[in-house]
Amino acid sequence: MRRGPRSLRGRDAPAPTPCVPAECFDLLVRHCVACGLLRTPRPKPAGASSPAPRTALQPQESVGAGAGEAALPLPGLL
């Protein structure tokens, strides 16, 4: 279905918050969900091929949260 790559056409970057209003990033499923549907992360199973997050949800003030510092974002703009 494709025929040969060419130069990238960029678009303006969205705001750093990852979800549209009224949605929050769910660390278990790794995508935005309705904020009311957020679940508490479970412990990561040993040897899981699609690992569950290792961390608890925390308030999102650190947009640059690293490993072990995952955060629950407030509703944001895309």
Epitope: R11, R30, H31, P51, P53, S62, G66, E69
Partner: antibody, heavy 118, light 107 residues
Framework: QVTLKESGPGILQPSQTLSLTCSFS??????????VGWIRQPSGKGLEWLAH???????YYNSVLKSRLTISKDTSKNQVFLKIANVDTADTATYYC??????????WGQGTSVTVSS | DIQMTQSPSSLSASLGERVSLTCRAS??????LNWLQQEPDGTIKRLIF???RLDSGVPKRFSGSRSGSDYSLTISSLESEDFVDYYC?????????FGGGTKLEIK
């Protein structure tokens, strides 16, 4: 402006290890809920997701190819790497990297062509 | 793994025509579906995310909808640049999976 660019060897031989690099700008992999994934497309065929890595170093792999895939990142250099071990002619494809956010892949690289041939 | 069955695999249509492409999910994926456009040179662009939300800069003639496990991309009035390839992508769970693609050709 978010941009991603893939680079690779172009051509390699069966049984070798394919090493791909995704160099990106306009975002950081130290940012919450950011990730980068790899997708490939054999000529004239559809898209196949391979692997992705998140800001917190969680990694996800295509279950069929998992034993041959290794994804990693260098956050300070804004780069993500994919290695595919023991390649075969079936691995001949265009390889794309893409940024991941709250709604999967939103920005894609231009693709790099890889040919496996003896 | 979740299978995404995309139809039709190819479609011939005329300028100004309204067309719809469909993807059917083998399991529940909620609204976790995107539509992608691939140009002849390989450039890939996301058009629709979360089933029905339009990406910035995408013309309003594109729209996405859902009916049960069927997801549709509709182009209300085809323009010349729309005759390219389209893919759906589910991201409800890993592994992410794509539909087989639809090649939209000019009649």
């Amino acid at each position: 402006q978010v941009t991603l660019k893939e680079s690779g060897p172009g051509i390699l031989q069966p049984s070798q290890t394919l090493s791909l690099t995704c160099s990106f700008s306009g975002f950081s992999l130290s940012t919450f809920a950011m990730g980068v994934g790899w997708i490939r497309q054999p000529s004239g065929k559809g898209l196949e997701w391979l692997a992705h890595i998140w800001w917190d170093d969680d990694k996800y792999y295509n279950s069929v190819l998992k034993s041959r895939l290794t994804i990693s990142k260098d956050t300070s250099k804004n780069q993500v790497f994919l290695k595919i071990a023991n390649v075969d002619t079936a691995d001949t494809a265009t390889y794309y990297c893409a940024r991941l956010g709250g709604y999967a892949m939103d920005y894609w690289g231009q693709g790099t062509s890889v040919t496996v041939s003896s | 793994d979740i299978q995404m069955t995309q139809s039709p695999s190819s479609l011939s249509a005329s300028l100004g025509e309204r067309v719809s492409l469909t993807c059917r999910a083998s399991q529940d994926i909620g609204n976790n579906l995107n539509w992608l456009q691939q140009e002849p040179d390989g450039t890939i662009k996301r058009l629709i995310f979360a089933t029905s939300r339009l990406d910035s800069g995408v013309p309003k003639r594109f729209s996405g909808s859902r009916s049960g496990s069927d997801y549709s991309l509709t182009i209300s009035s085809l323009e010349s640049e729309d005759f390219v390839d389209y893919y759906c992508l589910q991201y409800a769970s890993s592994p992410y999976t794509f539909g087989g693609g639809t090649k939209l050709e000019i009649k």
